[in-house]
């Protein structure tokens, strides 16, 4: 009788579809992820199964708590789609599909500087390029550890460019750039490039 009741409940909204989610939706190859399959009904003993496309990855029983499936994303096909099934006795419902976005991390960018020196000013052009990593890549330029540009998004493998004009300074300035894509908490920085102070013939980046 209980199985019949459960099945009848499923035909109403008393037993809705489970929800499949992960805290990390954007991942890089080799990353470990946890997938959570949960259900609104906290009183039933539910069997959760996880699938990717048409392969079965695992089964767990749960009551009140989400089932946690731990996976390692090592191949492109492991991005998904995933779905989970919640089953009570002979009745089951499926979640919506869930897919990860696999992103290659950015490599350390290279910063190039070009300077046009006038009597009073320096016209500085900064170029920053990360040769590896999934696009788009956001570049930010820094002077003495302070951001001097907005994030510049590049959807192609071309350097980001930022121009600035400075009064001929009396002290050294250090420039670097940051490259970041959709991978959360993963940014890389170029080696710093130091611009010497003015005085004498000390402008190694200047166009004469």
């Amino acid at each position: 009788r209980k199985a019949v009741l459960d099945c009848e409940a499923m035909k109403t909204n008393e037993f809705p579809s489970p929800c499949l989610d992960s805290k990390t939706k954007v991942v890089m190859k080799g990353q470990n992820v946890s997938m959570f399959c949960s259900h609104k009904n906290k009183s039933l003993q539910i069997t959760y199964s996880l699938f990717r496309r048409k392969t079965h990855l695992g089964t767990q029983d749960g009551k009140g708590e989400p089932a946690i499936f731990n996976l390692s994303i090592t191949e492109a096909h492991e991005s998904g789609p995933y779905k989970c099934k919640a089953q009570v006795t002979s009745c089951s419902k499926y979640s919506r599909d869930f897919s990860f976005t696999i992103v290659d991390p950015v490599t350390s960018p290279v910063l190039n500087i070009m300077v046009i020196q006038t009597e009073t000013d320096r016209h500085i052009t900064l170029h920053c390029l990360s040769v590896n990593g999934s696009l788009p890549i956001n570049y930010t330029f820094f002077e003495n550890h302070v951001a001097i540009s907005p994030a510049i998004s590049k959807y192609d493998r071309e350097p980001a460019e930022f121009n600035l004009t400075k009064k001929n300074p009396g002290e050294e300035e250090e420039y670097r750039c940051e490259a970041k894509n959709r991978l959360p908490n993963y940014a890389t920085y170029s080696h710093p490039v130091t611009m010497p102070s003015t005085g004498g013939d000390s402008c190694p980046f200047c166009l004469k």
Partner: antibody, heavy 119, light 111 residues
């Protein structure tokens, strides 16, 4: 070249045991699923069981308990251990590879190995 | 789980349109976890159709598949001499564990 080669078949007495091997080349068992299928002389194809890329195993109702599938990743080989063999287990045994993430779309097959259970 | 294939055998001529059906006692996983195979005597089966209707690599376009849930069809639009063989369907299920089942085959012979 992607291929599967079965071995280990032969004549065995009723009640005996046999271990079949399925050697994979050209691909890794850590990515693909391997399924064992058998065919008695003049009869239908019959699903025995499957081992997926994660090492999870699945069996048909009749095979559970008597047949065991395992794998050795270092040898890139899958095994079918068959115990308590009966005359009705006489068949050609095939191993087959599924598509990535599709256990039972069997696109690569071995040549088969004949198992005869007779006294 | 029962996978019933019909007819069990049929005779046809070259150029004929041939239809084979597979009826499952319950729905396959995702409503389309079904594949079709061709087998010739003494040979291993060959994958023809997957996802119920998608043509496997290298399979001639005269083969097609259709259906969903519990009822599936394999059609050969114009039978060729090399098509005389036995055809099997294979369904994947998740109702009582992760499970597969073959139909018992349809033998296509020359009329």
């Amino acid at each position: 070249e992607v291929q599967l080669v079965e071995s280990g078949g032969g004549l065995v007495q009723p009640g005996g045991s046999l271990r079949l091997s399925c050697a994979a080349s050209g691909f890794s068992l850590t990515i693909y699923t391997i399924t064992w299928v058998r065919q008695a002389p003049g009869k239908c194809l019959e699903w025995i069981g499957t081992i997926n890329s994660y090492g999870n195993t699945y069996y048909s109702t009749w095979a559970k308990g008597r047949f065991t599938i395992s794998r050795d990743n270092s040898k890139n080989t899958v095994y079918l251990q068959m115990n308590s063999l009966r005359a009705e287990d006489t068949a050609v045994y095939y191993c087959a590879r599924g598509y990535v993430d599709s256990d039972w779309y069997l696109n690569i097959w071995g040549q088969g190995t004949l198992v005869t259970v007779s006294s | 789980i029962q996978m019933t294939q019909s007819p069990s055998s049929l005779s046809a001529r070259v150029g004929d349109r041939v239809t084979i059906t597979c009826q499952s006692s319950e729905s396959v996983y995702d409503n389309n976890y079904l594949s079709w195979y061709q087998q010739k005597p003494g040979k291993a089966p060959k994958l023809l159709i997957y996802d119920a209707s998608r043509l496997a690599s290298g399979v001639p376009s005269r083969f097609s598949g259709s259906g969903s849930g519990t009822q599936f069809t394999l059609t050969i639009s114009s039978l060729q001499p090399e098509d005389f063989a036995t055809y099997y369907c294979l369904g994947g299920y998740d109702s009582s564990g992760w499970y597969a089942a073959f139909g018992c085959g349809t033998k296509v012979t020359v009329l």
